[in-house]
Interface confidence: low
Amino acid sequence: AEEQLEGGLRTAKDGPAAAKAAVRFHFRTSKGPEREGCYLSVGHSQPLEDCSFNMTAKTFFIIHGWTMSGMLENWLHKLVSALQMREKDANVVVVDWLPLAHQLYTDAVNSTRVVGLSVAKMLDWLQGKDGFSLGNVHLIGYSLGAHVAGFAGNFVKGTVGRITGLDPAGPMFEGVDIHRRLSPDDADFVDVLHTYTRSFGISIGIQMPVGHIDIYPNGGDFQPGCGLNDVLGSIAYGTIAEVVKCEHERAVHLFVDSLVNQDKPSFAFQCTDSNRFKKGICLSCRKNRCNGIGYNAKKTRNKRNTKMYLKTRAGMPFRVYHYQMKIHFFSYKSVGAIEPTFYVTLYGTNAESQVLSLEIVEQIGLNATNTFLVYTEEDLGDLLKIKLTWEGTSRSWYDLWREFRSYLSQPHRPERELSIRRIRVKSGETQRRLTFCVEDPEKTSIAPGQELWFYKCRDGWRMKNETSPTVELS
């Protein structure tokens, strides 16, 4: 069966493209200018020597996906440059399967297995060379290319060191068994970035976890800077297709960011789902629950299909600083269901944050501790104080009359008033816990349109500190 596949591989199906090889391995050496002639071919050792292929170094294979243009896109050149900058001695090979990828999507999907087999044959041949080790091989596949990488890892004799799936394609792969898509069995370590997943309409990227660790930046769906307004602002003809491209391709740019901005690494946190992450529940680094993203992701034992989440900026560098905030809202009377809008401003030794809204994922729990996630784009340094604001809302005359009557019967406590004594904060990036208290223990109440200040009053929450990601991932 493999021979049949191999036979069908050599050329694209019809037309002028039939003369061209359907899969080409373009070896991109960082030694000197790029040379068109550096194409690798099974059984031909000369190009390896001509182009200074380093048998003992890391070898990256970059695999593109389905294409509308029929050309190698800009992201690929950026990724090649970033890899060469980060790993100066490494071999970078671009797997060019354009004649098969620039077809109907369904036809391109049907070619992924055969392209994966071609990559596996190349790896099998290279394994016969002195010094070459599969453990040093890192396959990086974008969209359909991620599944090509999976097939290559499945077909190769031995185990590839690592596969990175950059928003693996969803249509025709979602929900299928592990032998028909990228899966954790395809390499020693499979890490995946999901940036265009949708639970409604068509999901261009695969929603299900398919690696050892599966990272969902911004929940894996709406990427900052990719809204229609953002896209319209940055190009002359913004379309839904541009939004799709922006979000789908964001996975590549996050990976490039992890290569070039080594001093600003982003961290992801293990969580069962996006909603729990949005609540700020999942900012722990205990038991390998946090990890670097992109190139900085590290293999951890016994993890498989582990979902991890983080927030990002709209552009490079993508790193943000995550904080968990725990606030206990005391209510001295039954106020019914309230939906307050709270904002916080964080003040640190380096800077102060913008005004950050506390996203209420479900509903405020009264006389209960509520957890929130906030994140800042700048490094604030050590936190010193917090300003909490309850946004005033317009109310009807009836509401005001009720509040006035309530005040007459109980002058000290107007309706829709809450009491907050302290805010507990945990930094995702440093894993430091801090407690912030009101200045005057007698003045803890807040009502719509008012603000309350909290000052650092304790290191920790009276609990032992957890490991910080910077320690764990260095």
Partner: antibody, heavy 119, light 106 residues
Framework: EVQLQQSGPELLKPGASVKISCKAS????????MHWVKQSHGKSLEWIGS????????SYNEKFKDKATLTVDKSSNTAYMEFRSLTSEDCAVYYC????????????WGQGTTLTVSS | ENVLTQSPAIMSASLGEKVTMSCRAS?????MYWYQQKSDASPKLWIY???NLAPGVPDRFSGSGSGNSYSLTISSMEGEDAATYYC?????????FGGGTKLEIK
Amino acid sequence: EVQLQQSGPELLKPGASVKISCKASGYTFTEYTMHWVKQSHGKSLEWIGSINPYYGGTSYNEKFKDKATLTVDKSSNTAYMEFRSLTSEDCAVYYCARYGNYVGYFDYWGQGTTLTVSS
Amino acid sequence: ENVLTQSPAIMSASLGEKVTMSCRASSSVHYMYWYQQKSDASPKLWIYYTSNLAPGVPDRFSGSGSGNSYSLTISSMEGEDAATYYCQQFTSSPYTFGGGTKLEIK
């Protein structure tokens, strides 16, 4: 606005050849595959084949392989379908259709070209 | 080739009535696509990826199915829905269409 403007109706004799055109506007011509579909009078639709304008790669329905030839002229954003050795079986409306954005379906169709073959 | 069989070939429905038409494939397909065609007009994309409505298609339309069996449903028939509906597959070449279901107003 995306438009596919097809050439006018054709009346030809059996054995002749015809070249139908489909001029695309409102989008980047080379970024979308162009397909051709046949609809005989009162009948269903039949896929003839497709052409990738970027490098001219074609794909045909086996049934039409000896009948149709698909070409493009990138300079004028026009796709062509040539039909040879015409018979009465070829009497039909022929549509060009753009294979749509990102993952694929026929999102825009030409208005159709009616081909009549009669002696 | 994958033969798509649509049923019924012709059907009529009263305004406000629920309408369901089906499309069976001789071999399993990944997704089904539906097109609407009115007389003397080109087909229009109506439903893509089995259940997604094309822009401008009223939400009374819905699509469903998997494997070999797919259907298009109109929750409440309106006059403008009278047309012929074709199903189509892209899973394997040649890309085939069903014979069509002609929907008329009763």
